[in-house]
């Protein structure tokens, strides 16, 4: 058996480190074996067999220049085995960091802090963590640890399935390289690292008959479970097309009706989501949608709805414009008659 | 030689924008994590922001959350720290610093003032 | 985000007398912490790091030890050139923070 211990990696390559000490061992001979030492496709002998060092040869310092292919041989001159030497540094502890777009899984990735110049793999698992006594502030590990399975395609990310909202997870990332290892513990709460997907479909149509209206309809992320036991609320923001300034309005539902949309001009808006109990952080914004209120008047018809104000909306006073207020209706609805006369505005 | 030269501090209003940049050379800038710290006149050490080699992953002090973005050219070896919504208190020396690893600044460069004031 | 605090803040000692330095964590960091002088004017320089090592090119009258939440900076015979603040700072978690610093003057 060969006296030289496999790293990890490639086999026949031997590692080491720059301005280190770095030994070389001979692969086909006997522990201890004095050899000779040559550079693959150089004659000059690097180390002779009477150095005392056996069937290992010593870099001192080594540097980029001492990477390459060598060649070690017997007393007789048989061929003892080639050696690659591969320079580079042992891991540090990799970046992690984990993200939640639900309440039942999260996925955490990572990325070295420092390349080593090694071929590197990293392992995952994890723990979930359980509070000891009512009142205790220590943590002990519970049952585990479990892997956390890595993603297929090589992506530097791993997904915990079935997480509990309310338990805490201690993950493990740990670098590994042929010259060691170093580990990332990360504690991880479900309920600080969830952020929701943003709200999907969003539609803004004009309501007929109502020049400042627009009508905002969503739905839930396909990412959110299907039957929530938490629910999301959502945060709505639009603008007129040119206007820098959002106004913002919280819906209590999955539609809004903007009540103070400037007449004639396209709307630009935009939903974000949150755990309805404030875990975690908002959503990034959905993809902007745009409509533009209706121009004309209200149908002569009066919807089954429609109880006290038939009249058409004013005209707009462009020498008075009102500033754009925020919607502020509690729980949207398709039309809502409070107010008696819509005043229209127009950015001046 | 490990060598790191910050730019682009100065004198900016409250409110105004900044950004300071880090050359580096000596070493193999794309294999290490980077980092600005920062020391107000007469204070102490303020860990500001780091990047991974890759870029991948960021962090950021509370202080400056949402206002600055860092950033890294590996092309170009040169470290970036974007500063929106400047505000007095981030009057301070800023120095580029370098790993091993993460949080172990190894080498620094000699800073660059950034004075906010009207 | 985990508190790091220095004693004393400032001290002044005579050549050749032991100065020592202490740190304190909020929480556990385990060896993570690392040692800085900086001089009047100048960047910080690392000289301890992972607690107890010594950076390459620092003099071995400087030494660190600890581990947890207490740790020890010690210079064993302080030198002029040793005038400088110096600070702790833990790298345990991915936001790095320094202790307040303790100033070294000579008697």
């Known amino acids: 058996s060969s006296p030289c211990p496999q790293a990890w990696g490639p086999p026949g390559v031997q590692y080491g480190q720059p301005g280190r000490s770095v030994k070389l061992c001979c692969p086909g001979v006997t522990a201890g074996d004095p050899v000779s030492w040559f550079r693959d496709g150089e004659p000059k002998l690097l180390q002779g067999p009477d150095s005392g060092l056996g069937h290992e040869l010593v870099l001192a310092q080594a540097d980029s220049t001492d990477e390459g292919t060598y060649i070690c041989q017997t007393l007789d001159g048989a061929l003892g085995g080639t050696v690659t030497l591969q320079l580079g540094y042992p891991p540090a502890r990799p970046v992690v960091s984990c993200q939640a777009a639900d309440y039942e899984n999260f996925s955490c990735t990572w990325s070295p802090s420092q390349i080593s110049g090694l071929p590197t793999r990293y392992l995952t698992s994890y723990r979930k963590k359980t509070v000891l006594g009512a009142d205790s502030q220590r943590r002990s590990p519970s049952t585990g640890p479990w892997p956390c399975p890595q993603d297929p395609l090589g992506a530097a990310r791993c997904v915990v399935h079935g997480a509990e909202f309310w338990s805490q997870y201690r993950i493990n990332v740990t670098e590994v390289n042929p010259l060691g290892a170093s580990t990332r513990l990360l504690d991880v709460s479900l309920q600080s690292i969830l952020r929701p997907d943003p709200p999907q479909g969003l539609r803004v149509e004009s309501v007929p008959g109502y020049p400042r209206r627009l009508r905002a309809s969503w739905t839930y992320p396909a990412s959110w479970p299907c039957q929530p036991h938490f629910l999301l609320k959502f945060r709505l923001q639009y603008r007129p097309a040119q206007h820098p300034a959002w106004s913002t309005v919280e819906p209590a539902g999955l539609e809004e009706v903007i009540t103070d949309a400037v007449a004639g001009l396209p709307h630009a808006v935009r939903v974000s989501a949150r755990d309805f109990l404030d875990a975690g952080t908002w959503s990034t914004w959905s993809p902007e949608a745009w409509g533009t209120p209706s121009t004309g008047t209200i149908p002569k018809e009066i919807p089954a709805w429609g109880q006290l104000h038939t009249q058409p909306e004013v005209e707009p006073q462009v020498d008075s414009p009102a500033p754009p207020r925020p919607s502020l209706q509690p729980h949207p609805r398709l039309l809502d008659h409070r107010d008696s006369v819509e005043q229209v505005a127009v950015l001046a | 030689e490990v060598q790191l030269l910050e730019s682009g501090g100065g004198l900016v209003q409250p409110g105004g924008s900044l950004r300071l940049s880090c050359a580096a050379s000596?070493?193999?800038?794309?294999?290490?994590?980077m980092t600005w710290v920062r020391q107000a006149p007469g204070k102490g050490l303020e860990w500001v922001s780091s990047i991974v080699p890759s870029g991948g992953h960021t962090q950021y002090a509370d202080s400056v959350k949402g206002r600055f973005t860092i950033s890294r050219d590996n092309s170009k070896n040169t470290l970036y720290l974007q500063m929106n919504s400047l505000r007095a208190e981030d009057t301070a020396v800023y120095y580029c610093a370098k790993g091993p690893g993460w949080g172990t600044f190894a080498y620094w460069g000699r800073g660059t003032l950034v004075t906010v004031s009207s | 985000d985990i508190q790091m605090t220095q004693s004393p803040s400032s001290l002044s000692a005579s050549v050749g007398d032991r100065v020592t330095i202490t740190c304190q964590a909020s929480?556990?960091?385990?060896?993570?912490l690392n040692w800085y002088q900086q001089k009047p004017g100048k960047a910080p320089k690392l000289l301890i790091y992972?607690?107890?090592n010594l950076q390459t090119g620092v003099p071995s009258r400087f030494s660190g030890s600890g581990s947890g939440t207490d740790f020890t900076f010690t210079i064993s015979s302080l030198q002029p050139e040793d005038i400088a603040t110096y600070y702790c700072?833990?790298?345990?978690?991915?936001?790095?923070?320094f202790g307040p610093g303790t100033k070294v003057d000579i008697k």
């Open positions: 700072q833990q790298y345990d978690n991915l936001s790095p923070t």
């Open positions: 992972d607690a107890s």
């Open positions: 929480q556990d960091i385990n060896n993570y």
């Open positions: 000596g070493f193999t800038f794309s294999w290490y994590s």
